[in-house]
């Protein structure tokens, strides 16, 4: 058993029917010695008396808010949550496996630049009685600070018969060094509580591996005289790290016909302009990627040829 | 060329070669992004590689003030990786494919280090750890890890030379 926060405790259980469970001793936070009684949740049934209460925790029915009273007065509370270890593995019932980029990916994170700011998100089908808290650090043995905000519900989607909820959190490394080569990964730890079930999820990454620039901005076409060619130009996204002579991007320019089946023409360039042939009803798209490290491409920025 | 005393390197040549190094490092190990090597017990294997750290002056401001600290650090790393790529880790079993980019990568590391430090000038270099994995699978894993950290190292070096070529070239 360990303390998650004040008056909230997590009991770790080997989870199989008839498992012995854990013996837990609760102590009433009071100087009083006599006349103390204990109850669980909303029930008025007295579970025991005295300053301490010893219980055997085996099932969810044994978890919940234990309260000690004296003469009708509430003295203190202890909330017991269960963390299930099923068949040798801590349970992962609360969050959905996103399966990208590999199985057992519950947390996904992205950064728009090298400033040390990043966003993580996760999915669940649970809509109520759900709380998350997020901690992060750079490295684990001698951790350096990363500050995370509160997790918020960022999207709701209908998937078949189920509703899916996306939560996200923003974090910022306290003393980020954008130009340095990272040697210690960022660790992100999410505590999830659904009703009386506790679970924890972790992710470990380097900022360089989760970089995904915003799409290029101000995408413009300039027709070239007496030609089907156009000059496409664009700018670095505002959110990208500066100076651009140091934090450089490379770009992919694509000409795509109306039908998805039509052949796509692609040009790669380090410049912020390119000359392409604009076909009727086609569109021109540009996306960006770090020039020197193959992290994710940005989403496409597009303009119609006409 | 970078002389320990402090003259400038051939920024544009260094930029071109370091960008080539980036391309080669990724073609040598392209699937790296899909493989979490940190799960594979990091032990002491690649912990000793020289990293370009915050105080090494490789940021735009540090380069403007005095690029020598940063160039020395990059040189140190290039020599370190050049020795690793020429070691038993890469020459032993399982043999690399004949068209593997590792050979080119090795030569380019040497080329860039020589651009930074011509004959007769000596910056102190870092000892390379004696890593001699006994099993072919350990060697394979170590190759992945070394190439993975090399990708990060050359990315920073390429940024340095690109910025130098754009802002510090005479």
């Amino acid at each position: 058993i360990w303390e998650l926060k004040k008056d909230v405790y997590v009991v770790e259980l080997d989870w199989y029917p008839d498992a012995p469970g854990e013996m837990v001793v609760l102590t009433c936070d009071t100087p009083e010695e006599d006349g103390i009684t204990w109850t669980l949740d909303q029930s008025s049934e007295v579970l025991g008396s005295g300053k301490t209460l010893t219980i055997q925790v085996k099932e969810f029915g044994d978890a919940g808010q234990y309260t000690c009273h004296k003469g009708g007065e509430v003295l203190s509370h202890s909330l017991l949550l269960l963390h299930k270890k099923e068949d040798g593995i801590w349970s992962t019932d609360i969050l959905k496996d996103q399966k990208e980029p590999k199985n057992k990916t519950f947390l996904r994170c992205e950064a728009k630049n090298y400033s040390g700011r990043f966003t993580c998100w996760w999915l669940t089908t649970i809509s109520t009685d759900l709380t998350f808290s997020v901690k992060s650090s750079r490295g684990s043995s001698d951790p350096q600070g990363v500050t995370c905000g509160a997790a918020t519900l960022s999207a709701e989607r209908v998937r078949g018969d189920n509703k899916e909820y996306e939560y996200s959190v923003e974090c910022q490394e306290d003393s980020a060094c954008p130009a340095a080569e990272e040697s210690l990964p960022i660790e992100v730890m999410v505590d999830a509580v659904h009703k009386l079930k506790y679970e924890n999820y972790t992710s470990s990454f380097f900022i360089r591996d989760i970089i995904k620039p915003d799409p290029p901005k101000n995408l413009q076409l300039k027709p070239l005289k007496n030609s089907r060619q156009v000059e496409v130009s664009w700018e670095y996204p505002d959110t990208w790290s500066t100076p651009h002579s140091y934090f450089s991007l490379t770009f992919c320019v694509q000409v795509q016909g109306k039908s998805k089946r039509e052949k796509k023409d692609r040009v790669f360039t380090d410049k912020t302009s390119a000359t392409v042939i604009c076909r009727k009803n086609a569109s021109i798209s540009v996306r960006a990627q770090d020039r020197y490290y193959s992290s994710s491409w940005s989403e496409w920025a597009s303009v119609p040829c006409s | 060329r970078a002389v320990p005393g402090g003259s400038s390197p051939a920024w544009t040549q260094c930029q071109q070669l370091s960008q080539k190094l980036c391309t080669l490092a990724w073609s040598a190990h392209p699937l790296v992004g899909h493989m979490d090597l940190r799960e594979e017990g990091d032990e002491e294997t690649t912990n000793d590689v020289p990293h370009i750290q915050c105080g090494d002056g490789c940021d735009p401001q540090g380069l403007r003030d005095n690029s020598q600290f940063c160039l020395q650090r990059i040189h140190q790393g290039l020599i370190f990786y050049e020795k690793l790529l020429g070691s038993d880790i890469f020459t032993g079993e399982p043999s690399l494919l004949p068209d593997s980019p590792v050979g080119q990568l090795h030569a380019s590391l040497l080329g860039l280090s020589q651009l930074l430090q011509p004959e007769g000038h000596h910056w102190e270099t870092q000892q390379i750890p004696s890593l001699s994995p006994s099993q072919p699978w350990q060697r394979l894993l170590l190759r992945f890890k070394i190439l993975r950290s090399l990708q990060a190292f050359v990315a920073v070096a390429a940024r340095v030379f690109a910025h130098g070529a754009a802002t510090l070239s005479p």
Epitope: D14, Y16, P17, F60, E86, D87, G88, D93 | -
Partner: antibody, heavy 114, light 107 residues
Framework: EVQLLESGGGLVQPGGSLRLSCAAS????????MGWVRQAPGKGLEWVSY????????SYADSVKGRFTISRDNSKNTLYLQMNSLRAEDTAVYYC???????WGQGTLVTVSS | DIQMTQSPATLSVSPGETATLSCWAS??????LAWYQQKPGQAPRLLIY???TRATGVPARFSGSGSRTEFTLTISGLQSEDFAVYYC?????????FGPGTTVDIK
């Protein structure tokens, strides 16, 4: 007390089908993963299939993949194993288990023979 | 699949003596290893899980040790009801796999 009671075994011809059931009692069935393990006469134990508490995730041994389907009805506290395209080598006692650890039923014998 | 090997295939022991059963995994299974006891005509019974933790109601004379690839089940002061077949099982990676079993019989 945890109890698991298998039923549905019997003699079936090769290529035939059987559906095994396992009625669970004495614990909160919907909270636990369940599985099927088999034991050929005089032989060792082999995992056949495994199902998570909600029923959404399942796993199968290669030897039965595509032929057997594990499912559960948490409202009825029952685990099922639908066995199709049965072969002689599927002959065994089939045990219902509470996940990879915990309790086992007494087993039901499936004989595949012409 | 992870292969489990057990040794010896048969162990002849006198009541009151100590029996030591070994189990090896073809690759690391961390501590995700269980030991089962099976008597003729009965279902297997869980004795040890997590390589070292005794299941509910299992007498203290049964103890497990080891991790990764090498595991041991020790039965000290063998009693008549302990003569049976003992299987080890890894549950680290699906498909979970059992060893071929060790028969402990009366010397």
């Amino acid at each position: 007390e945890v109890q698991l009671l298998e039923s549905g075994g019997g003699l079936v011809q090769p290529g035939g089908s059987l559906r095994l059931s396992c009625a669970a009692s004495g614990f909160t069935f919907s909270h636990y993963r369940m599985g099927w393990v088999r034991q050929a006469p005089g032989k060792g134990l082999e995992w056949v299939s495994y199902i998570y508490s909600s029923g959404g995730l399942t796993s199968y041994a290669d030897s039965v993949k595509g032929r057997f389907t594990i499912s559960r009805d948490n409202s009825k506290n029952t685990l099922y194993l639908q066995m199709n395209s049965l072969r002689a080598e599927d002959t065994a006692v089939y045990y219902c288990t509470t996940g990879a650890l915990g309790q086992w039923g007494q087993g039901t014998l499936v004989t595949v023979s012409s | 699949d992870i292969q489990m090997t057990q040794s010896p295939a048969t162990l002849s022991v006198s009541p009151g003596e100590t029996a030591t059963l070994s189990c090896w995994a073809s690759q690391s299974v961390k501590s995700n290893l269980a030991w089962y006891q099976q008597k003729p005509g009965q279902a297997p019974r869980l004795l040890i899980y997590g390589a070292t933790t005794r299941a509910t109601g299992v007498p203290a004379r049964f103890s497990g040790s080891g991790s990764r690839t090498e595991f041991t089940l020790t039965i000290s002061g063998l009693q008549s009801e302990d003569f049976a077949v003992y299987y080890c099982q890894q549950y680290d990676v699906w498909p979970f796999t059992f060893g071929p079993g060790t028969t402990v019989d009366i010397k």
